[in-house]
């Protein structure tokens, strides 16, 4: 557990007359209809807000939006609809704001049905003013930005055309028809998938992969027999056609699709999938699905090339393409993910992993916690959490886990406590050392939010009743002080504080309900106020990372490095600050065994770190290798875990061994690619 | 054949506890769990808990927490529940009954409900002062 | 917590006749829901589970119907035996709940 002061609550003072000072009311001039809000930037306070509400009448549906504008984090908005013209907002589309700091913002606007095509309005000043801009084409998708060039705009039509623009979307161009799926890729490139025949649907499993690096001037096939494809840290994976049935494969490339290697592993067939869990640089996390409707699959993980695989999780829960998991990247810890399994008897079980996929075990029991009825005993069991499949169960869970990159080992949760996740009404739980120890933090379902870096957090009561009381804690959950931010309760819809956790605003977002009326309000409130001062040195302490033995010379080593932090301590109350940087010192490992997977045609004997080579490749898939342009396989049987750091220690040495004769040939082969110029 | 036999008729005074037994024979006691429902004069059923024969852990109702505890014996195959702080509302009768399907949420082949397909005959508890 | 509503509270029928009640869960219990019988003086006794499903021992006149919120009992033909109360009751979200239960009485 992260380090803290064992001591009663003591109550922050004058708080309530600090955040009543602090509190702002704003009544939105509309009817109840839906609400949608974005923030425009990073630390510029301007939040825009759509409000639409859809009136039916007996022929159509019309629609009315309106535009409010921020710049003080909500305190205060501006109605901007005339901005827009008074147009009707086409919400399924979002509003569209660009990377970064570029202070972009594009609206697509709902158009009359005769008309040539769409129309957006675009913003390049954080939303001070909009251009209108009538679209030679019906947008199908919203407006997608290139990661690397804000200007740089692209977007499929309803007509399955890919259109782009590269000057924010004042002048478009279609670059190519028969589009099925278009992502941007690294260095403005494109990737895009086409049908030759029919059209999407009935071309799966015989698209091409098409990539352009120079915005549709030319074009290259990069894969043929293609059923779908993705993007993934440095990794460009599509799912290809076997030539003989109905079965796909997963191929790799980390050139943009020059060259192709088949990835090692489980081909699937008509009714099953693959998935991208999460991606980086080093490595991937990928699903796949089991045969038949069972819901679950495999998580295999990835060795740097994205071409051999380790099994990691057996009956992941997964339910359809496209559907529920609870897969969930514990972003306050290095190497933390937490997910859900489907047992024997149906009932579903959460993991954990602290070494990025290598090992995966339950979650400790919280010591301030029973177990449940899910419990075969009263003293042993687990903590489960609720994430995407509970809340798509409509079990009560209102928000699914929570954790920030800049509040250091924070993770907050709902959860029961037993041998699997119960039906019964969830507690809320929070880690303070990244998923290691856990403890009740609320009673009840609730809607959580990490401020200031971790030095507020902020907690609402779900409730079918009007509210008016907000919670916040300032010692990591350990102490709870209530606000009523408001004599007249409102019906809660939602808790928005700015991405990132830096902000010190919270914005409770809901509706009043009056005998013949019904309108939005939000209460902004800032508490600057309550941490009155700066963090200084004596407020933080030194805290080693995945430390679970201090006796052992190697704790806290976690993939070939163990990091000690600066952390808040729990006692202060101070503010972190908008400016505050995570604070590490790394220091390097010796290498151990843990730190290698087993390379193609090797394998670890169960209860074994040493890996040992496969007696012969009979038996086994022989498309499970290399392809693309290798000659030969050289592998010692060991590769290093991606982004282990280690040095020293262990050095597993094996004779390299020629396997290149075992292969047969790749699906997506140079020979089969061919280019083109517009 | 299956039956729970429940413990005879108790009078209590306002703020004591009452503690009822179940005594389950005719099935693995071990393998089904057991609910307590209860039921004032003139009123509907109330659902109060369930107990994990096995491992003897609880889920109680959220208007019964705090004050209701379940327990069970292997031993005598029995479970027992005792409400405490009694009030004059908690006059009832008090039934335990087989609950097989527990408590655990489902994967997608969907969680089925058996329903509490064996009662016992139930046990009146009158609070008076 | 959910809330199950029976209606009518009362129904009035003559033996023979068809009785069909009715129950309905403020939420989706999807098919988590079962009907019991209560006769005075005795402890309620399963009917129906799963919705649909009848329990070991309940005659073919007793049928439960529905998925979601809306729920039905129907008892085909009424017997003497029959008339008594009836309880739904919904095992998807804790904490178990009873509806207020319909009295079938002799008309």
């Known amino acids: 557990s992260a380090p803290g002061e064992d001591e009663e609550c003591g109550r922050v003072r004058d708080f309530v007359a600090k955040l009543a000072n602090n509190t702002h009311q704003h009544v939105f001039d509309d009817l109840r209809g839906s609400v949608s809000l974005s923030w425009v930037g990073d630390s510029t306070g301007v939040i825009l807000v759509l409000t639409t509400f859809h009136v039916p009448l007996v022929i159509m549906t019309f629609g009315q939006s309106k535009l409010y504008r921020s710049e003080d984090y909500g305190k205060n908005f501006k109605d901007i609809t005339d901005l827009i013209n008074n147009t009707f907002i086409r919400t399924e589309f979002g509003m569209a704001i660009g990377p970064e700091n570029s202070g972009k913002v594009v609206l697509t606007a709902e158009v009359s049905g005769g008309s040539r095509g769409g129309r957006i309005f675009r913003s390049s000043d954080f939303a001070k003013n909009f251009v209108q801009t009538d679209l030679p084409f019906h947008p199908l998708t919203q407006m997608m930005y290139s990661p690397q060039n804000s200007d740089y705009l692209l977007a499929l039509s309803t007509e399955n055309g890919l259109w782009v623009s590269k000057n924010f979307g004042g002048k478009w161009e279609e670059i190519h028809k028969a589009v099925c799926l278009a992502k941007w890729g690294s260095d403005n490139t494109i990737f895009f998938t086409t049908y030759a025949n029919g059209s999407c649907k009935a071309d799966l499993g015989a698209l091409e992969l098409w990539r352009t690096s120079d915005l549709g001037k030319s074009f290259k096939t990069i894969g043929v027999k293609i059923y779908s494809f993705g993007l993934g840290g440095r990794f460009l994976f599509a799912s290809v056609m076997a030539d003989k049935d109905t079965t796909r494969r997963i191929h790799v490339s980390t050139d943009q699709g020059d060259t192709w290697s088949m990835a090692q592993l489980p081909s699937v067939g008509q009714e099953q999938f693959y998935s991208i869990l999460a991606a980086n640089d080093d490595m991937v996390f990928m699903h796949v699905d089991e045969p038949g409707d069972t819901g679950f699959g495999t998580i295999f993980t990835s060795d740097d090339r994205g071409i051999v695989y380790s099994k990691s999780l057996d009956r992941h829960l997964y339910t359809t393409t496209g559907g529920e998991t609870d897969f969930t990247n514990v972003t306050s810890l290095r190497g933390v993910y937490i997910t859900s399994v489907l047992s024997e008897d149906n009932s579903i079980q959460t993991m954990i992993t602290f070494d990025q996929g290598g090992r995966w075990t339950h979650l400790r029991k919280p010591e301030n916690s029973e177990c449940d009825a899910t419990a075969k005993n009263k003293n042993e069991c687990s903590l489960h959490i609720h994430a995407s499949y509970s809340i798509s169960q409509k079990l009560n869970v209102p928000m699914a886990p929570l954790s920030e990159p800049n509040a250091v080992g924070i993770v907050i949760a709902h959860g029961s406590v037993g041998d699997a996740i119960s039906v019964m009404v969830p507690d809320v739980y929070i880690s303070d050392d990244g998923g290691y120890s856990w403890t009740k933090m609320l009673e009840g379902p609730h809607y959580y939010t990490i401020l200031d870096s971790g030095g507020i957090i902020v907690a609402i009561e779900h409730s079918s009743r009007p509210i008016n009381v907000i919670k916040f804690s300032t010692d990591e959950g350990q102490c709870w002080q209530t606000y009523t931010f408001t004599r007249d309760p409102i019906y809660f819809t939602g808790l928005a504080s700015e991405p990132g956790a830096r902000s010190m605003n919270i914005s409770i977002w809901g509706f009043t309900e009056s005998f013949l009326t019904s309108q939005w309000v939000s209460y902004t409130i800032d508490f600057k106020d309550i941490l009155e001062r700066n963090c200084e040195e004596k407020d933080y302490t030194i805290w080693l990372a995945h430390s679970t033995d201090p006796e052992d010379y190697e704790d806290g080593c976690i993939l070939g490095y163990k990091e000690q932090f600066l952390r808040l301590r729990k006692s202060s109350v101070c503010q972190n600050g908008r400016d505050y940087v995570v604070t590490k010192q790394p220091s390097i490992c010796l290498c151990s065994l843990e730190d290698f997977l087993c390379d193609f045609g090797y394998y670890r004997p169960e209860n074994d770190s040493k890996c040992v080579e496969q007696p012969e490749l009979k038996g086994h898939d022989l498309e499970f290798c290399l392809y693309g342009r290798e000659e030969h396989l050289t592998t010692n049987g060991y590769r290093k875990i991606p982004g282990d750091k280690c040095q020293g220690g262990v050095n597993p040495v094996r004779e390299v061994k020629d396997l290149k004769k075992k292969c047969t040939s790749n699906f997506l082969s140079p020979e089969k690619q061919n280019s083109k110029s517009n | 054949q299956v039956q729970l036999v429940q413990s005879g008729a108790e009078v209590k005074k306002p703020g004591a506890s009452v503690k009822v037994s179940c005594k389950a024979s005719?099935?693995?006691?071990?393998?089904?769990?057991m609910s307590w429902v209860r039921q004032a004069p003139g009123q509907g059923l109330e659902w109060m808990g369930i107990?994990?024969?096995?491992?003897?852990?609880?889920s109680y109702a959220q208007k019964f927490q705090g004050r209701v505890t379940m327990t069970r014996d292997t031993s005598t195959s029995t479970v027992y529940m005792e409400l405490s702080s009694l009030r004059s509302e908690d006059t009832a009768v008090y039934y335990c009954?087989?609950?097989?399907?527990?408590?655990?949420?489902?994967?997608?082949?969907?969680?089925?409900?058996?329903?509490?397909?064996?009662w016992g005959q139930g046990t009146t508890v009158t609070v008076s002062s | 917590e959910i809330v199950m509503t029976q209606s009518p509270a009362t129904l009035s029928v003559s033996p023979g006749e068809r009785a069909t009640l009715s129950c309905r869960a403020s939420q989706s219990v999807s098919s988590n829901l079962a009907w019991y019988q209560q006769k005075p003086g005795q402890a309620p006794r399963l009917l129906i589970y799963?919705?649909?499903t009848r329990a070991t021992g309940i005659p073919a006149r007793f049928s439960g119907s529905g998925s979601g919120t809306e729920f039905t009992l129907t008892i085909s033909s009424l017997q003497s035996e029959d008339f008594a109360v009836y309880y739904c009751?919904?095992?998807?979200?804790?904490?178990?709940?009873f509806g207020g239960g319909t009295k079938v009485e002799i008309k």
């Open positions: 005719g099935y693995t006691f071990t393998s089904q769990y």
């Open positions: 799963g919705a649909s």
């Open positions: 009751q919904q095992a998807r979200l804790g904490p178990w709940t």
């Open positions: 009954a087989r609950d097989p399907s527990g408590i655990a949420a489902a994967g997608p082949a969907s969680r089925y409900y058996y329903g509490m397909d064996v």
């Open positions: 107990i994990n024969p096995y491992g003897g852990s609880t």
